[in-house]
Amino acid sequence: LPAQVAFTPYAPEPGSTCRLREYYDQTAQMCCSKCSPGQHAKVFCTKTSDTVCDSCEDSTYTQLWNWVPECLSCGSRCSSDQVETQACTREQNRICTCRPGWYCALSKQEGCRLCAPLRKCRPGFGVARPGTETSDVVCKPCAPGTFSNTTSSTDICRPHQICNVVAIPGNASMDAVCTSTSPTRSMAPGAVHLPQPVSTRSQHTQPTPEPSTAPSTSFLLPMGPSPPAEGSTGD
């Protein structure tokens, strides 16, 4: 004959454990039912009666099957530099993440405890590492032959335009200026911006003067946002 299914509460066989969604109550020495997410144990089980569960009150929650006497308090409301990406419900805590243009400088188990504005690279510097949800932008000086004329957390350095006749040579923070004859762009016009979040970092010394010939060992080149600046400015 098949073994009878035990209903909670029941005494477990020696050496065995309670089933899924049950817990062993040390006082009653019985296997008892857990409460479902969104509930908590209002009355613990005895040898003759099972756990009595009750719904979590407003602004409290339980995310797992449990036998806690009180639900957990939801975290405080999101601050002005954050957005609520998950609301407080009876089954889940509120989650706050940083709003666009900011990154999480101090995380917590879920969401972010402290947001900080993404660094901005000043003219002459460009984004060398885009910011992410959890990391700041890194700024580096524009290499010879490139420039950034913006203060931005999303712009990288991009090549100077190539002129038939140069009126003013470009530098790290300014594009070359051509005479009235139309220039030959080494890139497509328009800026490509880095995704938010992005920020930048401390200033750096300018690179050594541009060699007389273009680097013979160019490698991977960046997506071309409008000329970013390479030092960082606080926000």
Epitope: V127, A128, P130, V192, Q206, T217, L221, P222, M223
Partner: antibody, heavy 118, light 110 residues
Framework: QVQLVQSGAEVKKPGASVKVSCKVS????????IHWVRQAPGQGLEWIGR????????EYAPNFQDRATMTTDTSTSTAYLELSSLRSEDTAVYYC???????????WGQGTTVTVSS | EAVVTQSPATLSLSPGERATLSCRSS?????????ANWVQQKPGQAFRGLIG???DRAPGIPARFSGSGSGTDTTLTISSLQPEDFAVYYC?????????FGGGTKLEIK
Amino acid sequence: QVQLVQSGAEVKKPGASVKVSCKVSGFNIKDFYIHWVRQAPGQGLEWIGRVDPEDGNTEYAPNFQDRATMTTDTSTSTAYLELSSLRSEDTAVYYCSTWDGFSYFDYWGQGTTVTVSS
Amino acid sequence: EAVVTQSPATLSLSPGERATLSCRSSTGPVTTNNYANWVQQKPGQAFRGLIGGTNDRAPGIPARFSGSGSGTDTTLTISSLQPEDFAVYYCALWYRNHWVFGGGTKLEIK
């Protein structure tokens, strides 16, 4: 003149470690990331990672997260790549570079051949 | 882990012809966030960056080289092949905190 000069060829046994150096000149090493890329015989390029000499922050390709260590010594303008637990598949030419996909300052070392063989 | 696939693996063309090389991201559309790059490798020579940011030519790169991006692909086009253009071309895409190279396309003389 910008130069990246790498250390000489290495022959190592499986399980050993190798440390390749890359001495840069002609620019301030703190101004640009130093990348490490490798190319196995007859194969394509594989990005290992990059290090920011200014603060030592590193970013690694997932495949190298556990075995590669990139460091720099700004006082000597030298970058280092150490690869541990070597296996035969690590036989390749290893390049350091100032290439960065976010800049156009693109110079490469001459390459260091690392051979892993028992 | 992201995989970058280049096609074709080998492309046989004659000087003067137009070459189109493709690079595809396994994680979906190639966006500006991927900072698509193209680099050239010739035997015994240093690597040479050609295109950055999908469409920016590196300083000193001839106008016959151009880049574009659409949907899942980023493309390198060489409008009229010169003898010196026959080489291996790699694309690389940025994935949040690391670069991934494609397997390369060998452009050979037909």
